[in-house]
């Protein structure tokens, strides 16, 4: 690092708000797409290149000039598994977090021309190639269609689709956001014979309605109506089907075979929460009760003679939590062995840590193959000899991530593949394996600048550096950058981790203002080893503010004792722990305890508001962006997972005493900035409207900003710049900064 320890003598520029908003310093990614066990695609100067993983040589797969005459701006592309066709996506129109509609064309790579016959319709909701060959499944107007050949007519699979009512092969709002984290509800079998799909019925689901103001010329605002089940409201129902795409006929309608939920689910409200193909003719389904502490995995086999799917109780696997909910957010997915007779799955062990358990499909009990006071984050690949996983075991740091492999013939033989590669720079890895796991790309995202490398599984040898961000490194040498401290405090004999973004030339003998950046939702993690260039970088670098985050009770990846501490009690311990963290930071000697602020977005906005409304006297001011204010306003799947039902027999009392509004009086002691997008489909504007009303009713002066037609991300270019500029002014004013 250039410069000196003396801040006054350091002539380098700081990282400014403009640098953040204009993205002056860009992190370079290396986004590859594996197309086989030894080749991947990479986009360079808009050419699509195909790389050989072993040798690193490349050739042009598709030149950027290919579609010069296309007439549309291509948003994305997808190559068929057999490499014969490329699907081009354009006219992209965003819907919710994952969902969008688009237009598609298919380009024949052999004939080097666009297919003009039997085109996929405009406003298609989802398209996916089969895993092998070049079949296509797509959803249009809430119905599913299959193309056996790109140039031939489609077969219609479903006929029941109806906007906002029946969804075939796509998710409704709550399943998209809270269950599958995807718009797709289609699952091809490994060889593309079968297409499994879910059907969601929102007939009885209440609608959220909000105004969309649109262009200034629109005299009457549009009303957006979305089926959205709030806590305790009527939920969507789900059905599951499988269709054989090898027996489709243009003469008769496709026959979809239903697989019903287990009876333990049918007796009440329930969700479909995972679909995984085990073999060509075996599928596993996970179902979850509305009270999300009980899930069932069904393993269903195809009966060729009848064309039906049989799910025997002897092969059911139940997962239950006595201390909270099942899974981190939902039950984890199984990873099946090649024969489909056994699988590996991350579940909570006796001590409440999430580890890998080995199941045989006909046995109820499983064998844990990992153990310890750390957690497995994800199973990344499974071969005949090894299972590869990411965990936070290394050096006992919950905020780190490393890649491990475990020998399946001897579970004691575990190797960390990433720990010692670059231990100072790289402590937080993710991975992308080739089709059969012969090669893998390691993506290191901190604490140093991101580093992308390619490796061979044969000997775990590093093959080459793909991107090291050296250009950015050179640029940042000329910037006074903050440093990041990751450490823990001990409260009630338990370690709780925090991170601090410290100003350049940090001097522990000086006093700094502190901003607590909070999320604090169940299974969240804000203290980690990731390198980021964000608003906090500006605040620390230019404004000399310490930006801290703290993972208290309810946070994830440290065992269920910590995570399930807030079960049925949102708005309690996770809120108290942020206040306690600020007190602890105050005692460290370098924090100006008259200038402590807090801010958060979404769940973080809720916690910020609850903290500011606690009357603790610790915080001078705070900002809540798109906060939850009362759990009865938020969606059923997320809320009920942690809070149960808002009924007198269940947990209504705590729903009612965990609102921001009930703390309105205490806001007289703090400076508060409340921000929300008017078109927030997720945390509805209603939530902030009710905070505002409650504050007005008790005479609290506060600041507020709405963002017209912005959703939960407030992410349009102008709104993004405006919100961060506005928040910067507020924080600077609060801290009496020039």
């Amino acid at each position: 690092n250039k410069g000196t320890d003396d801040a006054t003598a350091d002539s380098r520029k700081t990282y400014t708000l403009t640098d953040y908003l204009k993205n002056t310093y860009r992190l370079k990614l290396y986004s590859l797409r594996w197309i086989s066990d030894h080749e991947y695609l990479y986009k360079q100067e808009n050419n699509i290149l195909v790389f050989n993983a072993e040798y690193g040589n490349s050739s042009v797969f598709l030149e950027n000039s290919t579609f010069d005459e296309f007439g549309h701006s291509i948003n994305d592309y997808s190559i068929s598994p057999d490499g014969q066709f490329i699907l081009l996506e354009y006219n992209y129109v965003k819907q919710w977090r994952h969902s969008y509609t688009a237009s598609y064309d298919i380009y024949d790579l052999n004939k080097r021309q666009l297919i003009t016959e039997e085109r996929i319709p405009n406003n298609t909701q989802w398209v996916t190639w089969s895993p092998v060959g070049h079949k296509l499944a797509y959803v249009w107007n809430n119905d599913i269609y299959v193309k056996i050949e790109p140039n031939l007519p489609s077969y219609r699979i479903t006929w029941t689709g109806k906007e906002d009512i029946i969804y075939n092969g796509i998710t409704d709002w709550v399943y998209e956001e809270e269950v599958f984290s995807a718009y797709s509800a289609l699952w091809w079998s490994p060889n593309g014979t079968f297409l499994a799909y879910a059907q969601f019925n929102d007939t009885e689901v209440p609608l959220i309605e909000y105004s969309f103001y649109s262009d200034e010329s629109l005299q009457y605002p549009k009303t957006v109506r979305v089926p959205y089940p709030k806590a305790g409201a009527v939920n969507p129902t789900v059905k599951f089907f499988v269709v054989n795409t090898d027996s489709l006929s243009s003469v008769t309608n496709a026959t979809s075979i239903q697989i019903t939920a287990p009876a333990s689910m049918l007796i009440g409200d329930h969700y479909l929460c995972d679909v995984t193909w085990a073999t060509q003719e075996r599928i596993s389904l996970q179902w979850l009760r509305r009270i999300q502490n009980y899930s069932v995995m069904d393993i269903c086999d195809y009966d060729e003679s009848s064309g039906r799917w049989n799910c025997l109780v002897a092969r059911q696997h139940i997962e239950m939590s006595t201390t909270g909910w099942v899974g981190r957010f939902r039950p984890s997915e199984p990873h099946f062995t090649l024969d489909g007779n056994s699988f590996y799955k991350i579940i909570s062990n006796e001590e409440g840590y999430r580890h890998i358990c080995y199941f045989q499909i006909d046995k109820k009990d499983c064998t844990f193959i990992t153990k310890g006071t750390w957690e497995v984050i994800g199973i990344e690949a499974l071969t005949s000899d090894y299972l590869y996983y990411i965990s936070n075991e290394y050096k006992g740091m919950p905020g780190g991530r490393n890649l491990y492999k475990i020998q399946l013939s001897d579970y004691t033989k575990v190797t960390c593949l990433s720990c010692e590669l670059n231990p100072e720079r790289c402590q937080y890895y993710s991975v992308s394996f080739s089709k059969e796991a012969k090669y893998y790309q390691l993506r290191c995202s901190g604490p140093g600048l991101p580093l992308y490398t390619l490796h061979s599984s044969v000997n775990d040898k590093g093959l080459r550096v793909l991107e090291d961000n050296s250009a950015l490194d050179k640029m940042l040498q000329n910037v006074q950058m903050p440093s990041k401290k990751l450490d823990f405090i001990i409260l009630n004999e338990t370690k709780f981790w925090y991170q601090m973004i410290l100003p350049p030339h940090f001097d522990k003998s000086k006093k700094y203002p502190l901003l607590l950046d909070v999320y604090a939702g169940p299974c969240s993690q804000k203290a980690d080893t990731v390198f980021r260039l964000n608003w906090a970088t500006y605040l620390a670098s230019t404004e000399n503010i310490i930006v801290a985050s703290f993972d208290g009770r309810g946070s994830g990846y440290q065992g269920d004792k910590i995570m399930h501490a807030i079960n049925r009690r949102l708005g309690t311990f996770e809120v108290e722990d942020q206040i306690e963290a600020a007190r602890q930071f105050s005692k460290m000697g370098f924090v100006d305890n008259k200038r402590i602020a807090i801010w958060g977005w979404s769940y973080g906005g809720y916690v910020t508001s609850m903290v500011l409304g606690s009357g603790s006297g610790v915080f001078k001011c705070g900002i809540a962006v798109a906060p939850v204010s009362r759990w009865e306003y938020y969606d059923s799947v997320y809320t009920e997972r942690y809070m149960g039902l808002p009924t007198p027999e269940d947990n209504l009392d705590h729903y009612r005493n965990s609102t921001v509004m009930s703390r309105a009086e205490n806001f007289k002691q703090v400076e508060y900035l409340l921000i929300h997008g008017t078109a927030d489909d997720n945390v509805h504007f209603q939530q902030s409207a009710q905070i505002s009303k409650a504050l007005v009713d008790v005479g609290v002066d506060f600041q507020a900003m709405w963002y017209t037609d912005e959703d939960h991300g407030i992410a349009s270019s102008t709104a993004h710049q405006h919100i961060y500029t506005h928040m910067s002014h507020f924080i600077k004013q609060c801290f009496s900064l020039p």
Partner: antibody, heavy 119, light 107 residues
Framework: EVQLVESGGGLVQPGGSLRLSCAAS????????IHWVRQAPGKGLEWVAS????????SYADSVKGRFTISADTSKNTAYLQMNSLRAEDTAVYYC????????????WGQGTLVTVSS | DIQMTQSPSSLSASVGDRVTITCRAS??????VAWYQQKPGKAPKLLIY???GLYSGVPSRFSGSGSGTDFTLTISSLQPEDFATYYC?????????FGQGTKVEIK
Amino acid sequence: EVQLVESGGGLVQPGGSLRLSCAASGFAINNYSIHWVRQAPGKGLEWVASIWPYGGFTSYADSVKGRFTISADTSKNTAYLQMNSLRAEDTAVYYCARFFSSYGDMDYWGQGTLVTVSS
Amino acid sequence: DIQMTQSPSSLSASVGDRVTITCRASQDVSGGVAWYQQKPGKAPKLLIYGTSGLYSGVPSRFSGSGSGTDFTLTISSLQPEDFATYYCQQGGDWPITFGQGTKVEIK
């Protein structure tokens, strides 16, 4: 070998109570669900109640809701049907059974126990 | 609740006959239908699960078919031991419901 054995049936007056037992062997009831099905003399089969011992979930036919309670003791591998406020129309042979597949088909049944409600 | 209606209520047949029993549901049956055989004084025995799956140990002369609301049990060649009462049952929608039964008697 999988077996289900019911006991506890008998003659009882209207308004009275009776507790039926269903002892399972050859499998753990924790891993299955147990269901009571009854058959009035000369009549068809009627589902009465179900329990999933591992989760503690229960479900009842409308005709017995509020009067009958299904329970299980996993340590004894036994399910029970507590029948209160008995009526003449509850007279039947009571069978316990377990599910075979997710479609609700029952592969193993007990031999049945007769409950007669009469004054 | 889904009503299951069996027809006929009873039938007379001879050994070797092909016998068909139908079961009609009041609405689409989600999962499928099971068929049971019951002899006097005995518990029901599972014959067919999931509409068409032949349960272990059940002779292959028994078969099941159907979808939606209409389901069929077929005995391809009636044997002396097959004279009994047969019940259909759906369990894919809660609550479980049974047909009223079909009695197969010797002609």
